[in-house]
């Protein structure tokens, strides 16, 4: 990946609208050292998208990914 790095990913802000669920292949939580807690969804095109873990749609997507 062009963004492979030894630096810890954090998020400046969150997307404002849900991504299509079908575009997402995996997710991870950012480090507790980051100032903004965030879920990062990774799309099938390997784009990393910052999302607010408190949003209902984000929790639903995480549950869906965990079950698949």
């Amino acid at each position: 990946s062009p963004y492979s790095s030894d630096t810890t990913p954090c998020c400046f802000a969150y997307i404002a609208r849900p991504l299509p669920r079908a575009h997402i292949k995996e997710y991870f939580y950012t480090s507790g050292k980051c100032s903004n807690p965030a879920v990062v969804f990774v799309t099938r095109k390997n784009r990393q998208v910052c999302a607010n873990p408190e949003k209902k749609w984000v929790r639903e997507y995480i549950n869906s990914l965990e079950m698949s």
Epitope: S5, D6, T7, P9, C11, F12, A13, Y14, I15, A16
Partner: antibody, heavy 120, light 110 residues
Framework: QVQLKESGPGLVAPSQSLSITCTVS????????IHWVRQPPGKGLEWLGV???????NYNSALMSRLNISKDNSKSQVFLKMNSLQTDDTAMYYC??????????????WGQGTSVTVSS | QAVVTQESALTTSPGETVTLTCRSN?????????ANWVQEKPDHLFTGLIG???NRAPGVPARFSGSLIGDKAALTITGAQTEDEAIYFC?????????FGGGTKLTVLG
């Protein structure tokens, strides 16, 4: 493809306000921030501020009292308003796309800029 | 507000390695400053090269690399090309705002 284009008045009288529009295409304002940066003639870059997908903003503290950044997601437009202009606000003004994750380039695509001259 | 300092000008030759640096007056630059590097070519053409200290943007040649060297952020061009002649700006994040350095004018003789 990703494009950003600034449009502004060109000439502004001292003490008046400046309004610039950044129109974007090739991506959605619900997924990226937009930064505003300026460059006075023959000088370096100065970061002015950013508006994030949810509408939150961060500003350059030295200019915060004179700056306002807003947007219209449906029109893919971001607006910069600056009050009380003086001659040292003469500059090229740029908008740049801002990915949300820190491991990417934080101002990856830039507009071509719009020239603003403050003069009576 | 923080002040970010860069070399005002550097000169190199094609094929040589050159390192540009970016210093903060508030102390050591760390990974939490998410150092970015932006290239300015003539006619106000700006391109983001490096983000998050050491991450190349897609399409940026592998000869460009970012790192921390001592207490500074650094941009290294390994095997400079004549087309790399440009002005390079670093930008550092300070919790809620960005600050740009003054820029380094890189001349590639040849």
């Amino acid at each position: 493809q990703v494009q950003l284009k600034e449009s502004g008045p060109g000439l502004v009288a001292p003490s008046q306000s400046l309004s610039i529009t950044c129109t974007v295409s090739g991506f959605s304002l619900t997924g990226y921030g937009i930064h505003w940066v300026r460059q006075p003639p023959g000088k370096g870059l100065e970061w002015l501020g950013v508006i994030w997908p949810g509408g939150g903003t961060n500003y350059n503290s030295a200019l915060m009292s004179r700056l306002n950044i807003s947007k219209d997601n449906s029109k893919s437009q971001v607006f910069l308003k600056m009050n009380s202009l003086q001659t040292d606000d003469t500059a090229m003004y740029y908008c740049a796309r801002g990915p949300l994750i820190t491991t990417e380039v934080s101002m990856d695509y830039w507009g071509q800029g719009t020239s603003v001259t403050v003069s009576s | 507000q923080a002040v970010v300092t860069q070399e005002s000008a550097l000169t190199t030759s094609p094929g040589e390695t050159v390192t540009l640096t970016c210093r903060s007056n508030t102390g050591a630059v760390t990974t939490s400053n998410y150092a970015n590097w932006v290239q300015e070519k003539p006619d106000h053409l700006f391109t983001g090269l490096i983000g998050g200290t050491n991450n190349r943007a897609p399409g940026v040649p592998a000869r460009f690399s970012g790192s921390l060297i001592g207490d500074k952020a650094a941009l290294t061009i390994t095997g400079a090309q004549t087309e790399d002649e440009a002005i390079y700006f670093c930008a550092l994040w300070y919790s809620n705002h960005w600050v740009f350095g003054g820029g380094t004018k890189l001349t590639v003789l040849g």
